[in-house]
């Protein structure tokens, strides 16, 4: 107890009334107004509580403090008076803050700031929406993926910032009268092939596809090594050339270089150059046979294999190339005597005659074309005098029945040396490669060296053997007549032909010899 009569035990936030009583300070309260025991406490009065008499007024918030309270303007409002706090409604000067004016960049890009009481909102521009995680940020609406499907199915939706476009897909174009871009765009497939908008190589044929096109190898062509077929960048080569390569197991530098040249010609070949390429191929062959180099050091059998390979390949190449020629008659001759006569026609019903220096060929046009083949009909004849050297001493194989008859009557017949080649070797071909059994025969008239008296003249063809080589044969060929320097042959198939002179004496009207012819 205090001598002056003031209690010293008053609790916190109270003051003594006298020596035995205390009273809570303003802003605090206790259970009873007068505190008489030290056990009582003074607790802060929350003036801001709902039932309180304190009213801060509109656009403001009441903030309780220890022993007191403050009124402050709500967020988004500010006092006109400038006083941060006040005590009652009469002191309240709170009014709305225009955040949009204060900070024009508040809504960032693509949004417009709209002031509201105590706050603001961002209104997105057309084609934008508020980002859920940041409601103040407008982001582009992707109309193409939003499920709205705003474009026609013939178009391709292209989203761009704040908008979208309906564009024709690659290989499509707007239908007549349609725009290209707005959402009412309607498109149709472009036929690049007929409109000439394609990039197909001349070795291919253009095929239109929906919205695109592809380039396919021409018939008889194949894709170049490593390039797939049916692509926009497909480049093809004539299969004719790719198969005409040096025969296996033959080692000749001269021949290898000849085939290098052939392959070069094949690589550079374009259908429009068929005429030039035919001439280059024949010139190359003519040059090879004019100076065969190490080819003639090969064993005889290998030389025959090479000749067989050259004849077979040449026929294929010429047949393939001549399909790209325009109608008409071609005649080419070369320094070493190689000669080509070739006629190209749309199918006609007549016989055709090709004349050369040393040979004439006659056949029916209707043999030339395979039924159902839309291309032109081709008949060709090549004379290759230079082939004779490579075919020197090539064997003549007679049909078994002829052979048997001859053996019975002429012991040792054809044993005293190989038959002699009297004429140039000629090769005949058609656009139709099925020429093993012609419906009407072909006739050849050969001019040749003089026949030695009492020697037998045979019309022969070169039969390509299974082993890639071959031999002379007479099957399907007959000798119609022979004079000293010319012979007429008739054959029921096409191949390479020649006139041989057999090594034996002819008896007068020998019936066995009639069998041979």
């Amino acid at each position: 107890q205090d001598s002056r009569g003031c209690a010293r035990w008053c609790p916190q936030d109270s003051s003594c009334v006298n020596a035995t009583a205390c009273r809570c300070n303003p802003g605090f309260s206790s259970f009873s107004e007068i505190i008489t025991t030290p056990m009582e406490t003074c607790d802060d009065i929350n003036e801001c509580a709902t039932l309180s008499k304190v009213s801060c007024g509109k656009f403001s918030d009441c903030w309780n403090t220890e022993g007191s309270y403050d009124c402050v303007c709500s967020p988004g409002y500010e006092p006109v008076s400038g006083a941060k706090t006040f005590k009652n409604e009469s002191e309240n000067t709170c009014q709305d803050v225009d955040e949009c004016q204060q900070n024009p960049r508040l809504c960032k890009s693509y949004g417009t700031c709209v002031n509201t009481l105590g706050s603001y909102t961002c209104q997105c521009l057309p084609g934008f929406k508020l980002k859920p995680e940041d409601p103040k940020l407008c982001t582009d609406v992707n109309e193409c993926t939003s499920g709205q499907n705003p474009c026609h199915s013939s178009t391709h939706c292209l989203n761009n910032v704040g908008s979208y476009q309906c564009r024709c897909r690659p290989g499509w174009q707007p239908i007549p009268g349609s725009p290209n871009g707005p959402n009412n765009t309607v498109c149709e497939d472009v036929d690049e092939c007929s409109s000439g908008q394609h990039q197909c190589d001349s070795s291919t044929v253009c095929f239109n596809t929906v919205g695109s096109y592809s380039c396919r190898c021409r018939p008889g062509w194949k894709p170049r090594h490593g390039i797939p077929n049916n692509q926009k960048d497909t480049v093809c080569e004539d299969m004719t050339f790719s198969t005409w390569t040096p025969p296996p197991g033959v080692h000749s530098q001269t021949l290898s270089r000849f085939f290098d040249k052939v392959q070069d010609l094949g690589r550079d070949y374009k259908p429009g150059l068929a005429n030039n390429t035919i001439q280059s191929i024949l010139q190359a062959l003519d040059e090879l046979l004019e100076a065969p180099g190490d080819l003639e050091t090969l064993p005889r059998l290998q030389q025959h294999c090479v000749a067989s390979h050259l004849l077979d390949g040449l026929e294929d190449v010429l047949r393939g190339l001549s399909k790209n020629l325009s109608n008409g008659l071609l005649n080419f001759s070369y320094p070493a005597g190689t000669e080509l006569s070739l006629e190209v026609q749309k199918q006609v019903d007549r016989s055709v005659t090709l004349r050369q220096n040393q040979a004439v060929m006659q056949l029916d046009w209707n043999q030339a074309q395979k039924s159902g083949d839309p291309g032109p009909s081709v008949v060709g004849l090549v004379s290759i005098p230079g082939m004779g050297k490579l075919l020197a001493e090539a064997p003549l194989v007679l049909e078994p029945e002829k052979q048997m008859l001859l053996h019975e009557t002429h012991q040792g017949l054809l044993q005293d040396g190989s038959p002699i080649l009297l004429s140039d070797v000629i090769s005949a071909f058609l656009s139709n490669n099925d020429t093993q059994n012609l419906s009407s025969p072909v006739t050849f008239t050969f001019s040749h060296r003089s026949v030695i008296p009492r020697q037998k003249v045979l019309c022969v063809f070169w039969e390509h053997g299974q082993n890639g080589c071959g031999h002379w044969a007479t099957t399907g060929c007959s000798t119609i007549g022979t004079r000293d320097t010319s012979t007429i042959c008739r054959c029921t198939h096409l191949s390479s032909f020649a006139v041989l002179m057999a090594h034996y004496d002819v008896q007068e009207e020998d019936p066995v010899l009639t069998v041979i012819t």
């Epitope: 530098q253 270089r257 290098d260 040249k261 040059e287 004019e290 100076a291 190490d294 070493a336 005597g337």
Partner: antibody, heavy 118, light 108 residues
Framework: LVQLQQSGVELARPGASVKLSCKAS????????ISWVKQRTGQGLEWIGN????????YYNEKFKDKATLTADKSSNTAYMELRSLTSEDSAVYFC???????????WGQGTTLTVSS | ENVLTQSPAIMSASPGEKVTMTCRAS???????LHWYQQKSGASPKLWIY???NLASGVPARFSGSGSGASCSLTISSVEAEDAATYYC?????????FGGGTKLEIK
């Protein structure tokens, strides 16, 4: 062994003609062509022309068309080049060489030196 | 005519050095139609490299040839004294056949 043996040194007067020979051995003469090449002292090689003995076909450098005539005799395996209307410009070493349309000039003769002088 | 231009006209190298000489054609030549010949003083030319890159029989492996189209080259990886000679390129892609002017290689 392939060999091309050329005729020896030739001396000729201006305006005259000369025939150089090149005898081949060791290979099939008609399987290859014979090329003729000119080389003036201190100068490079100049192709004159080719002859292919099998056919007798000749191919000339336009520059030598009126100067040289190429021939070949299959029976003696010999190629010849005749040079006419000789001038001092024709003084040179002339080589023959074996080749084809497809093969390089793989064997050469030893050369014939031609001197044209009055 | 297809003119062949060789460069340099004369070059000098020390033994062991690598040297390259080039041959440029006025129009494209197939690689199989281009050859190189070596000619030593007072001797006949010898086939040295055929078809652009193949060494003729007896040619040392230090020689090589390369190129395509209108340009090709002859390289010696490590020059030796016996390589002193004039080297000619030659084409027979078409008539007239032509030779380059030659590159004379001198050894220091």
């Amino acid at each position: 062994l392939v060999q091309l043996q050329q005729s020896g040194v030739e001396l000729a007067r201006p305006g005259a003609s000369v025939k150089l020979s090149c005898k081949a051995s060791g290979y099939i003469f008609t399987s290859y062509g014979i090329s003729w090449v000119k080389q003036r002292t201190g100068q490079g090689l100049e192709w004159i022309g080719n002859i292919y003995p099998r056919t007798g076909n000749t191919y000339y450098n336009e520059k030598f068309k009126d100067k040289a005539t190429l021939t070949a005799d299959k029976s003696s395996n010999t190629a010849y080049m005749e040079l006419r209307s000789l001038t001092s410009e024709d003084s040179a070493v002339y080589f023959c060489a074996r080749g084809t349309h497809y093969d390089p000039l793989d064997y050469w003769g030893q050369g014939t030196t031609l001197t044209v002088s009055s | 005519e297809n003119v062949l231009t060789q460069s340099p006209a004369i070059m000098s190298a020390s033994p062991g050095e690598k040297v390259t000489m080039t041959c440029r054609a006025s129009s494209s030549v197939s690689s199989s139609d281009l050859h190189w010949y070596q000619q030593k003083s007072g001797a006949s030319p010898k086939l040295w490299i055929y078809s652009t890159s193949n060494l003729a029989s007896g040619v040392p492996a230090r020689f090589s040839g390369s190129g395509s189209g209108a340009s090709c080259s002859l390289t010696i990886s490590s020059v030796e004294a016996e390589d002193a000679a004039t080297y000619y390129c030659h084409q027979y892609s078409g008539y007239p056949w032509t030779f380059g002017g030659g590159t004379k290689l001198e050894i220091k």
